[in-house]
C-alpha cells in the first residue's frame, strides 16, 4: 500500500467521511448498496460551490445519483459505478476529496452502518484479482488502420499484487513474436504494438493472476488496409427535397476520397424533349464546380435560392478522382405556396423511381 492510501470496506448506505486533501481513499461496496461519499469543507470553513466528478467527467444528478455540495449518494450501485470520484471546487477545480470506489458482484453482508466488521469476510486485504475499471473494458474489438499503434489495457488489482501476461490466439505472446516487438507496462497493465501490420490480426488475451485466482479478458484486433478506390459518397445524400415556391433549398453531398476529389453539381435537363443523348448519356448542366477559391466543404453543399417551378427536377452530385467517378442523385419537388408540404421521402418514392 502506498502512503496516504487507506483501504476500507463499507456496508450499505455507510457514509464515508472525506480523506485529507491529497489522500485517496479506496472503498469497496457491494452490488445494490448505496454509495455515500462525504466531503466536509477543509478546516470546517465555507466551501463554496462544488462539483462531483467521476473518472474526469462531471456527475449529472438523477433519481439514482443524488448530488449535494458536501455529499454524493449513488443508489443501487453496480459495477459501472466503480471508478475514481472526486469533489472539486467549481471555480478552481481544486480537488477537495478523492475516492476510489469499487463495487463488487456480491452485495455486502449485514446491515450495520459503519461496515467495519466486514473487512475479514470480503477478501480485500488478501484476495483474488479483480478489474479496477471494468466499465472501460467494453471495447472488445479494435479496428485499426495499418501503420498506427494499438494499446490493450487490463487494469487490475488484488492482494498480493497480481502478475499480468499476454496471449495471442491462445498462445504465449512475447516481443520476439513480432517484427518491431511489443512494449509492456506492467504498472499500467498494458501492451503496446507500434505500427501494426495485417499479420498482427488476432485475439489478444490478458491473464491477470495471483495465488488466489486468475481473471482474463480477450480483445480482437483487426488491421485495416487501404486499397485505392474511387470516391465514396455517403449513403442517403443528397436527399430528396420538397419545397414551396420561393423558398430556399440545400442539397448535401458527403465525399470520402484518398486521392483529391473533384466535385461537381449537375442538373438533369431535357434537350428536344429527350433526357438522354443518342449514346444514353443524360443531358446535364453544370451548376457548381471547383474554382480557384472554392473549398471541398463548399462544394459539398448546393444552395438554391428563391426556387421556381423550373428548378424542380433531378440533381446529381458527381465526384471523381484519379481512380474513377461516383455519383448520387436526388429530386426536388416545387409546390405552389398554398399547397401543404409533402414529406420528402414520400416525394422520393414517387419521383426517384
Amino acid at each position: 500500500e502506498s502512503l496516504g492510501t487507506e483501504q476500507r470496506v463499507v456496508g450499505r448506505a455507510a457514509e464515508v467521511p472525506g480523506p485529507e486533501p491529497g489522500q485517496q481513499e479506496q472503498l469497496v461496496f457491494g452490488s445494490g448498496d448505496a454509495v455515500e461519499l462525504s466531503c466536509p469543507p477543509p478546516g470546517g470553513g465555507p466551501m463554496g460551490p462544488t462539483v462531483w466528478v467521476k473518472d474526469g467527467t462531471g456527475l449529472v444528478p438523477s433519481e439514482r445519483v443524488l448530488v449535494g455540495p458536501q455529499r454524493l449518494q449513488v443508489l443501487n450501485a453496480s459495477h459501472e459505478d466503480s471508478g475514481a470520484y472526486s469533489c472539486r471546487q467549481r471555480l478552481t477545480q481544486r480537488v477537495l476529496c478523492h475516492f476510489s470506489v469499487r463495487v463488487t458482484d456480491a452485495p455486502s453482508s449485514g446491515d450495520d452502518e459503519d461496515g467495519e466488521d466486514e473487512a475479514e469476510d470480503t477478501g480485500v486485504d488478501t484476495g483474488a484479482p479483480y478489474w479496477t475499471r471494468p466499465e472501460r473494458m467494453d471495447k472488445k474489438l479494435l479496428a485499426v488502420p495499418a501503420a498506427n499503434t494499438v494499446r490493450f489495457r487490463c487494469p487490475a488489482a488484488g492482494n498480493p499484487t497480481p502478475s499480468i501476461s499476454w496471449l495471442k490466439n491462445g498462445r504465449e505472446f512475447r516481443g520476439e513474436h513480432r517484427i518491431g516487438g511489443i512494449k509492456l507496462r506492467h504498472q499500467q497493465w498494458s501492451l503496446v504494438m507500434e505500427s501494426v501490420v495485417p499479420s498482427d490480426r488476432g485475439n489478444y488475451t490478458c491473464v491477470v493472476e495471483n495465488k488466489f485466482g486468475s481473471i482474463r479478458q480477450t480483445y480482437t484486433l483487426d488491421v485495416l488496409e487501404r486499397s485505392p478506390h474511387r470516391p465514396i459518397l455517403q449513403a442517403g445524400l443528397p436527399a430528396n427535397q420538397t419545397a414551396v415556391l420561393g423558398s430556399d433549398v440545400e442539397f448535401h453531398c458527403k465525399v470520402y476520397s484518398d486521392a483529391q476529389p473533384h466535385i461537381q453539381w449537375l442538373k438533369h435537363v431535357e434537350v428536344n424533349g429527350s433526357k438522354v443523348g443518342p449514346d444514353g448519356t443524360p443531358y446535364v448542366t453544370v451548376l457548381k464546380t471547383a474554382g480557384a477559391n472554392t473549398t471541398d466543404k463548399e462544394l459539398e453543399v448546393l444552395s438554391l435560392h428563391n426556387v421556381t417551378f423550373e428548378d424542380a427536377g433531378e440533381y446529381t452530385c458527381l465526384a471523381g478522382n484519379s481512380i474513377g467517378f461516383s455519383h448520387h442523385s436526388a429530386w426536388l419537388v416545387v409546390l405552389p405556396a398554398e399547397e401543404e408540404l409533402v414529406e420528402a421521402d414520400e416525394a422520393g418514392s414517387v419521383y426517384a423511381g
Epitope: G56, R136, M137, V144, P145, A146, R151, E225, R226
Partner: antibody
Framework: EVQLVESGGGLVQPGGSLRLSCAAS????????ISWVRQAPGKGLEWVGR????????NYADSVKGRFTISADTSKNTAYLQMNSLRAEDTAVYYC????????????????????WGQGTLVTVSS | DIQMTQSPSSLSASVGDRVTITCRAS??????LAWYKQKPGKAPKLLIY???FLYSGVPSRFSGSGSGTDFTLTISSLQPEDFATYYC?????????FGQGTKVEIK
C-alpha cells in the same frame, strides 16, 4: 526513410491567401495523417489542424476555423494548408508532421502522435 | 480548451545533471501526453508518447511518467545535445494543446 518537406511560405498582405504544401514520402499516407503546427517568432508551438487520411476527416484549432482548410492528394502523397483571410497574428513558421493514432481499448478517443516533422516554412503576414 | 502548464519555464543545469520538468493539465487527460524537444531553428522531435513510452531511437536517459493531470519528463544524465526547449502536448481533448515550453540552458 520518412521525409516531410513544406513549401509555399512567403510574404502576404493581411486579408490575403496562401497555400502551403507538405510533400511526404516513406510511409503509408493513406493510413495515417498529417498535422499542421505553427510557431510564431520567439513563441511556443500551436496546433493548427489535422487531416486524417483514413476517412478524410479534418479538425481545426478555433483560431483558424473557417479561414484555413487542410486537404490532401494521396496520389501525390501531399497535404495542403489553404490559408485565407490571413492576419498579422498568423505570422509563424508552419510545420507539417506525420501523425499516427494510438487506438486504445480503454478510451473512446484516439490519441494522436506527431512523430516526424518537416523543416518548416515561414509565413509572414504584413502590409 | 485543456490548458497545459509547464514548470519551470527555464532552468540551468550542467552536463551529467538529473533534470526534471513537470507538466500539469487543467483537466484529466489520462495518459494522452507527449513530450517534444526543439533546438533553435529546428523542427520539434518526439521523445515520449502516451506519458511514458519512449519513442524509437530516443536515448534511454529520457523517461516520462504520470497520468491524469500531472506528468514528468526526466533526463537522468544531461548531455550536451540535450540543451534545448521541451514541450508537453495533450491529445485527448480537442484541440490538441501544448505547454508553453521549458528551456534547458547550460549553467
Amino acid at each position: 526513410e520518412v521525409q516531410l518537406v513544406e513549401s509555399g511560405g512567403g510574404l502576404v498582405q493581411p486579408g490575403g491567401s496562401l497555400r502551403l504544401s507538405c510533400a511526404a514520402s516513406g510511409f503509408p499516407f493513406t493510413s495515417t495523417g498529417i498535422s499542421w503546427v505553427r510557431q510564431a517568432p520567439g513563441k511556443g508551438l500551436e496546433w493548427v489542424g489535422r487531416y486524417w487520411a483514413w476517412d478524410g476527416s479534418t479538425n481545426y484549432a478555433d483560431s483558424v476555423k473557417g479561414r484555413f482548410t487542410i486537404s490532401a492528394d494521396t496520389s501525390k502523397n501531399t497535404a495542403y494548408l489553404q490559408m485565407n483571410s490571413l492576419r498579422a497574428e498568423d505570422t509563424a513558421v508552419y510545420y507539417c508532421a506525420r501523425t499516427y493514432g494510438i487506438y486504445d481499448t480503454y478510451d473512446m478517443y484516439t490519441e494522436y502522435v506527431m512523430d516526424y516533422w518537416g523543416q518548416g516554412t515561414l509565413v509572414t503576414v504584413s502590409s | 480548451d485543456i490548458q497545459m502548464t509547464q514548470s519551470p519555464s527555464s532552468l540551468s543545469a550542467s552536463v551529467g545533471d538529473r533534470v526534471t520538468i513537470t507538466c500539469r493539465a487543467s483537466q484529466d487527460v489520462d495518459t494522452s501526453l507527449a513530450w517534444y524537444k526543439q533546438k533553435p531553428g529546428k523542427a520539434p522531435k518526439l521523445l515520449i508518447y502516451s506519458a511514458s513510452f519512449l519513442y524509437s531511437g530516443v536515448p534511454s536517459r529520457f523517461s516520462g511518467s504520470g497520468s491524469g493531470t500531472d506528468f514528468t519528463l526526466t533526463i537522468s544524465s544531461l548531455q550536451p545535445e540535450d540543451f534545448a526547449t521541451y514541450y508537453c502536448q495533450q491529445s485527448t481533448g480537442h484541440p490538441q494543446t501544448f505547454g508553453q515550453g521549458t528551456k534547458v540552458e547550460i549553467k
